[in-house]
């Protein structure tokens, strides 16, 4: 077809942004392009074209009229991770194409199993006590907190230090005795370890 004076090649006017999304949640990678004729939009991940509902009606990815890529739910398994990666949108018309900036889609995960559960500890009053846990693997890396007898531990107590997976009580009191649980938390949620008992013996 003949080049019309008012026609112009595509340009990306809204680029996709990096995302961290929880598995199973919906997500959108935005892309908006201008051009005349109106450009068609396709998405690519790691150099491969991304299939959407336009290719397969059962797909969990939808190409929205705006050109954005909508995920009905982020799919992410122990091995197959079809949604994670670096995406670009490409806008095309007969005058050329425009490629968006890269946008990484990362999947937030928090596994169920603690790599190390805390163990029971028995100390005499006034002695230090240490409990240690390693939370489940997660992305973003889970933060660690502790509960005692079902309530968050008062880490404002200067005797108590939480560093990495270690809970340290510099000198124990009788009142420190109880059931302790390590808690790993990130944007996915939280996981609780098995219970460990701290027994504080009278001297």
């Amino acid at each position: 077809s003949r080049l019309r004076q008012e026609d112009f090649p595509p340009r990306i006017v809204e680029h996709p942004s990096d995302l961290i999304v929880s598995k199973g949640e919906p997500a959108t990678l935005n892309c908006k392009a201008e051009g005349r004729p109106t450009p068609t939009i396709e998405w690519y991940k790691g150099g491969e074209r991304v299939e959407t509902d336009k290719d397969d009606p059962r797909s969990h990815r939808m190409l929205l009229p705006s050109g954005s890529l909508f995920f009905l739910r982020i799919v992410h398994g122990r091995r197959s991770k079809p949604d994670e990666g670096v995406y670009v949108c490409v806008a095309r018309n007969y005058l050329g194409e425009a490629v968006s900036h890269n946008a990484s889609l990362e999947v937030a995960i928090l596994r169920d199993d603690f790599r190390q559960n805390p163990s029971d500890v028995m100390v005499a009053v006034g002695e230090p006590a240490v409990m240690e846990c390693q939370p489940p693997r997660g992305h973003p890396e889970p933060t660690i907190s502790w509960k005692k007898d079902g309530s968050p531990l008062d880490d404002k107590d200067e005797r108590i230090t939480i560093r990495g997976g270690k809970l340290m009580i510099t000198y124990t009191r009788k009142s420190d005795a109880g059931k302790y649980v390590c808690v790993g938390t990130n944007m996915v949620g939280e996981r609780e370890s098995e219970v460990a008992e701290l027994t504080v013996l009278e001297r």
């Epitope: 991940k45 790691g46 491969e48 074209r49 991304v50 299939e51 290719d55 397969d56 799919v75 992410h76 398994g77 122990r78 091995r79 197959s80 991770k81 079809p82 949604d83 990666g85 169920d112 199993d113």
Partner: antibody, heavy 118, light 105 residues
């Protein structure tokens, strides 16, 4: 349409090797692990291993280590399973299967019958 | 290695019956358990993933339950097309159960 199409039936002599292909279409080949499963006549399903098409990484159960090789050609979205030093008890239907992001084999090839006979 | 034990290995049932198949793992696999149906001469078909999630396009008469080591596949009202062999699979180490053949009584 998402599908896996496997190569045709093979007849091999004991001690020989067989290479079965599995052509993937309708989805991003590098996004999903590919597994191989076999089924001897009248028997159950036996997992043989996986390949990550993205980087070619593989894993096999102890039973098949040293005898099975899994490869892929991303340019033609095809996975391959090579089984060497064939024995009569390797006679089976060999399936490729895609592992979904839900940790299950959601798409299967039609199967390839491999007969090992002298 | 995680060993999957399915029971029974075979059962006879009539159309309309409620059928239950069990699968036991030799160690805890959380909810990493799938169920497949296979008909003679055909590839297996995914029915249930993650112990209880129904695969798209699978009739709602199929359901799965359980976690840890004990799992169940239930067919609420057996239909003629359900006579087949059923396999459980754990998706941690990927081994299959031995199968349960559902035959016509």
């Amino acid at each position: 349409e998402v599908q896996l199409v496997q190569s045709g039936a093979e007849v091999k002599k004991p001690g020989a090797s067989v290479k079965v292909s599995c052509k993937a279409s309708g989805y991003t080949f590098t996004g999903y692990y590919m597994h191989w499963v076999r089924q001897a006549p009248g028997q159950g399903l036996e997992w043989m291993g996986w390949i990550n098409p993205k980087d070619g990484d593989t894993e096999f159960p102890q039973k098949f280590q040293g005898r099975v090789t899994m490869t892929r050609d991303t340019s033609i979205t095809t996975a391959y399973m090579d089984l060497s030093r064939l024995r009569s008890d390797d006679t089976a239907v060999y399936y490729c299967a895609r592992e979904s992001g839900d940790d299950a084999f959601d798409i299967w090839g039609q199967g390839t019958m491999v007969t090992v006979s002298s | 290695d995680i060993v999957m034990t399915q029971s029974p290995s075979s059962l006879s049932a009539s159309v309309g019956d409620r059928v239950t198949i069990t699968c036991r793992a030799s160690q805890s696999i959380s909810s990493y358990l799938n169920w497949y149906q296979q008909k003679p001469g055909k590839a297996p078909k995914l029915l249930i993933y993650a112990a209880s999630s129904l695969q798209s396009g699978v009739p709602s008469r199929f359901s799965g339950s359980g976690s840890g080591t004990d799992f169940t596949l239930t067919i609420s009202s057996l239909q003629p097309e359900d006579f087949a062999t059923y396999y459980c699979q754990q998706s941690v180490g990927l081994s299959f159960g031995g199968g349960t053949k559902v035959e016509i009584k």
